[in-house]
């Protein structure tokens, strides 16, 4: 086993140079010192090593820094960043935005989305700010990575980034994430008015509260059914038939095609059938006339 062999006499290198290209893999394992590699990372990148040799160097560095690489080394990683896994990156402490941008440049076009996202998350965790430059450096990676950040990390994301978020970016976000992103979006678009505001905010409405939706229903926004379906059930069921009618405008007719699917079905179950009948759409599933609604959540609290 490579680990057991001792370094042959005279083979211990004092610097990273081309001689190492000609070492056997077991000799690299036995002879190369991780701190030397860390000190001369520029040469590790400059000299044409093989994939296997670079993997050995990575192993040596990991053994030298089991708690994660120091920032002084991370700053020098350059192309060696390609050998680092997202799990490695989660151990790092990165405070320099320049380091992040440099490494993001290295990862571009390398199928390294997971590493890039982990790097930015690690930077945010250390109190860094995700500025628009950094989002641009993340390039073609869909902003769905916002959903991978912890809620604490999300707090560090400036509201201005919300301008760059597209409709599909939030599909996999948890409810908690959506709520936080919605607040940021409200703040980002606060100076935008009318329909333009609605066009921007609708991507984030999955995080809106019932109060927010009520307010929105006063503005003739004519929400499309696709946006309506993305609203959180808890907020939606609190809206009356009249409020939903205002919210959807002419798109109210599309409720019929969705009546047996969540969240429309959940909303219907909470409405009085007589109110639904007034819409003239043939919607079924409301509370029959004369029935009393018991909130079982309250009962459970006392049992």
């Amino acid at each position: 086993d490579a680990e057991q062999k001792a370094c042959p006499p005279g083979k211990e290198p004092y610097k990273v140079d081309e001689d190492l290209i000609f070492y056997q893999n077991w000799e690299l394992e036995a002879c190369v010192d991780g701190t030397m590699l860390a000190r001369q990372m520029d040469l590790v990148n400059e000299i044409p090593f093989t994939y296997e040799q670079l993997s050995i160097f990575k192993h040596k560095l990991d053994k030298t820094y089991p708690q994660g690489y120091p920032e002084s080394l991370i700053q020098q990683l350059g192309h060696f960043f390609r050998y680092v896994s997202p799990e490695d990156i989660h151990q790092w402490n990165v405070t320099s935005p320049d380091t992040v941008k440099t490494l993001l440049k290295v990862s571009k076009g390398q199928k390294m989305n997971a590493q890039a996202i982990a790097l930015v998350a690690c930077y945010l965790r250390g109190g860094g700010q995700l500025d628009e430059d950094m989002v641009k450096a993340l390039g073609d990676i869909p902003l769905s990575y916002l959903c991978d950040f912890s809620p604490q990390d999300l707090h560090s994301v400036p509201s201005s980034v919300m301008w760059l978020v597209g409709p599909q970016d939030l599909d996999k976000c948890s409810q908690r994430h959506l709520g936080l992103l919605y607040q940021k979006a409200c703040s980002a678009f606060q100076n935008v008015s009318g329909l333009e505001y609605f066009e921007k905010i609708k991507t984030f409405l999955g995080g809106a509260s019932v109060k927010d939706l009520r307010a929105l229903s006063q503005h003739n926004v004519s929400m499309d059914i696709a946006t309506f379906k993305r609203l959180q059930v808890d907020s939606l069921v609190g809206l009356s038939v009249a409020e939903v009618q205002k919210l959807l405008g002419p798109n109210i007719v599309d409720l019929k095609t969705e009546e047996d699917k969540s969240p429309v079905r959940d909303w219907l179950f909470r409405q009085h059938q007589k109110d639904l009948d007034r819409l003239g759409l043939g919607l079924q599933g409301g509370i029959p006339n004369g029935y009393l609604v018991l909130d079982f959540n309250v009962r459970e609290a006392f049992s």
Epitope: N45, E46, P48, Y51, L54, G78, H79, R82
Partner: nanobody, 119 residues
Framework: QVQLVESGGGTVQAGGSLKLACAAS????????MGWFRQAPGKEREGVAI????????YYRDSVKGRATISQDNAKKSVSLQMNSLRPEDTAIYYC????????????WGQGTQVTVSS
């Protein structure tokens, strides 16, 4: 598309010589180093010699020093390896390689040419 095509391999008696050639096409202008690696049956791949195309600096593995010479023809984007005093342990498939500066591992590999040294 980058192509590295090796030629000159074959069977030779121990003590004999061979000249391997590698013709490169499609290499980016920025490439700065070429070389030869070899792999014997059941052994790991190992570097034989490299040459920095910009400076002409050459490096060799210990076991071929004094017996091998790597040289380049910049105009033709080609590199050759002259091997003298061949030994049975030089038997392997020889691969031509090329790389751009600071770009991680060797990016471009040829298909290889077989060298067999019989005793």
């Amino acid at each position: 598309q980058v192509q590295l095509v090796e030629s000159g391999g074959g069977t030779v008696q121990a003590g004999g010589s061979l000249k391997l050639a590698c013709a490169a096409s499609g290499l980016p202008r920025t490439y700065n180093v070429m070389g030869w690696f070899r792999q014997a049956p059941g052994k790991e791949r190992e570097g034989v010699a490299i040459i920095y195309t910009t400076t002409g600096a050459t490096y060799y593995r210990d076991s071929v020093k004094g017996r091998a010479t790597i040289s380049q023809d910049n105009a033709k984007k080609s590199v050759s390896l002259q091997m003298n005093s061949l030994r049975p342990e030089d038997t392997a498939i020889y691969y031509c390689v090329a790389r751009q500066p600071n770009s991680g591992p060797w990016e471009y590999w040829g298909q290889g040419t077989q060298v067999t040294v019989s005793s």
